[in-house]
């Protein structure tokens, strides 16, 4: 009986339904390729339920396998622009703790102006995800063109 | 004991597992950029479990955070075709109720013939999702090239 | 009481949380367009929880609706290379049992060097998924550039 009752009383977060969808806040200074994210209902349709933002980077609060997804669109971009400024590359990875640093997802824009992808990956409490955009083109800040999110899938 | 028993008796839909995967039915008349979708086992591998179709547009039946995904491929397309007829753009958004109208996901084809993306977004019961394809190229109706779906993720 | 207790004792797999994320092992011999996959913690961040590998192809162990996702990047590729070697196409499908053979997801590279997509599809125990890469370019074996996975979503 206790387990059934406990289930009724547990907040959603304790069921492992950690999820976040972020919108672009700003890019870093010149030598910092990281994108800085923001989230919360006041900003539109972005949110954090479980994970947190640490100086614009996403920090995981629950161990598990996550679906990580991202879309980045380059600002004022045409296929000509994109090819001229090649290579522009986006990489999503664990950037801290340093001992767990690894690239999880990498895409180049080539002659396109948008990249979008997703993957399943194990993440641990305390992992911070960074999204590095290398190249001389700026990402669009439109919330329907550039976004980044994670979804807890299973322990 | 009641909760455990109730769980055993509840249909899947009541657990919040709403999900749909749709295939292209047809495009709209010239001044209507919307794509019209269809779904159901008789049509192949498309289905609706929870959400419904309203005149070819997807209507949400349960509040929650959803993973929305889409792939659209242009018919008889090469990179030359795609670049010549730029801009061809796909946007997924809430089109009704009007008070909640917003673009959720937007991609341009540039020199490519396929776009594919996904995002997490809060949706409410009664929200209708529209997929607008602007441009003068037709979307492929092949079920492995063009599809649109949603998956309930959490309340 | 029994159901609640049973829930506590059931392994995750019995809850239907089947999930796999694979990395590229190798390509097939010349006349075989299939990509051969591998997975497991010893290899990095790939894993199989439920599904199994059968000679490098992914075999499903539980009926249900799955989210299938894939990213493939071509090795030593530029937009010039990609367009010159066009058409390079990736298709994900059920390849056995033969009675259920069908293409689920298809993308061409055109002038790009990466394709990434995802879709929801019903799969049955025993279905084997094959990923066919046609063309004369090799896929990258970098684990952040080429990967393939499935996630059980609902019965």
């Amino acid at each position: 009986q206790r387990f059934a009752q406990a289930q009724q009383q547990l907040p959603l977060e304790s069921l492992g339904w950690d999820v976040a969808e972020l919108q672009l806040n700003h890019t870093g200074p010149q030598q910092d390729p990281r994108l800085y994210w923001q989230g919360g209902p006041a900003l539109g349709r972005s949110f954090l339920h479980g994970p947190e933002l640490d100086k614009g980077q996403l920090r995981i609060h629950r161990d598990g396998i996550y679906m990580v997804h991202i879309q980045v669109t380059l600002a004022i971009c045409s296929s000509t622009t994109a090819s001229r400024h090649h290579p522009t590359t986006l990489a999503v990875g664990i950037c801290s703790p340093a001992s767990r640093s690894i690239s999880l997802l990498r895409l180049s824009f080539h002659q396109g102006c948008t990249i979008a992808s997703q993957r399943l990956t194990p993440l641990a409490r305390g992992d911070t995800l960074c999204t590095n955009l290398t190249g001389t083109l700026l990402p669009s800040r439109n919330t329907d063109e550039t976004f980044f999110g994670v979804q807890w899938v299973r322990p | 004991q009641r909760f455990a028993q109730a769980q055993q008796q509840l249909p899947l839909e009541s657990l919040g597992w709403d999900v749909a995967e749709l295939q292209l039915n047809h495009t709209g008349p010239q001044q209507d950029p919307r794509l019209y979708w269809q779904g159901g086992p008789a049509l192949g591998r498309s289905f609706l479990h929870g959400p419904e179709l309203d005149k070819g547009q997807l209507r949400i039946h349960r509040d929650g955070i959803y993973m929305v995904h889409i792939q659209v491929t242009l018919a008889i397309c090469s990179s030359t075709t795609a670049s010549r007829h730029h801009p061809t753009t796909l946007a997924v958004g809430i089109c009704s109720p009007a008070s909640r109208s917003i673009s959720l996901l937007r991609l341009s084809f540039h020199q490519g013939c396929t776009i594919a993306s996904q995002r997490l977004t809060p949706l409410a019961r009664g929200d209708t999702l529209c997929t607008n394809l602007t441009g003068t190229l037709l979307p492929s109706r092949n079920t492995d090239e063009t599809f649109f779906g949603v998956q309930w993720v959490r309340p | 009481q029994r159901f609640a207790q049973a829930q506590q004792q059931l392994p995750l797999e019995s809850l239907g949380w089947d999930v796999a994320e694979l990395q590229l092992n190798h390509t097939g011999p010349q006349q075989d367009p299939r990509l051969y996959w591998q997975g497991g913690p010893a290899l990095g961040r790939s894993f199989l929880h439920g599904p199994e590998l059968d000679k490098g192809q992914l075999r499903i162990h539980r009926d249900g609706i799955y989210m299938v996702h894939i990213q493939v990047t071509l090795a030593i590729c530029s937009s010039t290379t990609a367009s010159r070697h066009h058409p390079t196409t990736l298709a994900v499908g059920i390849c056995s049992p033969a009675s259920r053979s069908i293409s689920l997801l298809r993308l061409s590279f055109h002038q790009g060097c990466t394709i990434a997509s995802q879709r929801l599809t019903p799969l049955a125990r025993g279905d084997t998924l094959c990923t066919n890469l046609t063309g004369t370019l090799l896929p990258s074996r970098n684990t952040d550039e080429t990967f393939f996975g499935v996630q059980w979503v609902r019965p």
Epitope: - | Q30, T73, A75, I76, T81, L137, R141, N142, E145 | -
Partner: antibody, heavy 120, light 111 residues
Framework: QVQLQQSGPEVVRPGVSVKISCKGS????????LHWVKQSHAKSLEWIGV????????DYNQKFKGKATMTVDKSSSTAYMELARLTSEDSAIYYC?????????????WGQGTLVTVSA | DIVLTQSPASLAISLGQRATISCRAS??????????LHWYQQKPGQPPKLLIY???NLESGVPARFSGSGSGTDFTLNIHPVEEEDAATFYC?????????FGGGTKLEIK
């Protein structure tokens, strides 16, 4: 409404060239490519080629390469086709045509045709 | 190039009856879930007029007595009931690839 107005009939001697025109009106000229089609008794309808009214890019039917040259003048919303080294085989009605809304080559809009007669 | 073969070359149909014209392609003109095959009507001294596009779609302003069907390599234009003003030559055309080609034409005469 969309209109394609072609130049008048031409009677020309063998071996010379002729340049015929097609002026578009009732729509944004640079929005849609223009196609040229030949109609003769011997060969029914034959597609000659297409020219982008936006940037002048062309695609020719292999059979008409060296015979036809398509050009465009955006300022006057006019497309031209020059036929070189004329022979009796080139005697035909030449139509310009335009696609409809979708960018695939079927033709709801046609010019009235230009009759070219090659005669000594 | 894709060759389109029309049959018959000519036919005479009584007023109110059904006219059926066939168009066969040397290879499939279907792709991406569409059939890129179109039908035109041409009367003497006039340019061709589009009747049907993508095998079965009626062009705006064309009477509903015209209908098209088929996929792959075999296509049909039906006119029912035939009216006096339908006397003309009918052409099929594909746009599956460059160059687009036309059928040889079918001349419809009203008896």
């Amino acid at each position: 409404q969309v209109q394609l107005q072609q130049s008048g009939p031409e009677v020309v001697r063998p071996g010379v060239s002729v340049k015929i025109s097609c002026k578009g009106s009732g729509y944004t000229f640079t929005d849609s490519a223009l196609h040229w089609v030949k109609q003769s008794h011997a060969k029914s309808l034959e597609w000659i080629g297409v020219i982008s009214t936006y940037d002048g890019d062309t695609d020719y039917n292999q059979k008409f390469k060296g015979k036809a040259t398509m050009t465009v003048d955006k300022s006057s919303s006019t497309a031209y086709m020059e036929l070189a080294r004329l022979t009796s085989e080139d005697s035909a009605i030449y139509y310009c045509a335009r696609r409809g809304y979708y960018d695939y080559d079927w033709f709801p809009y046609w010019g009235q045709g230009t009759l070219v007669t090659v005669s000594a | 190039d894709i060759v389109l073969t029309q049959s018959p070359a000519s036919l005479a149909i009584s007023l109110g009856q059904r006219a059926t014209i066939s168009c066969r392609a040397s290879k499939s003109v279907s792709a991406s879930g569409y059939s890129f095959l179109h039908w035109y009507q041409q009367k003497p001294g006039q340019p061709p007029k589009l009747l049907i596009y993508l095998a079965s779609n009626l062009e705006s302003g064309v009477p509903a007595r015209f209908s098209g069907s088929g996929s792959g390599t075999d296509f049909t234009l039906n006119i029912h009931p035939v009216e006096e003003e339908d006397a003309a030559t009918f052409y099929c055309q594909h746009s599956r690839e460059l160059p687009p080609t036309f059928g040889g034409g079918t001349k419809l005469e009203i008896k």
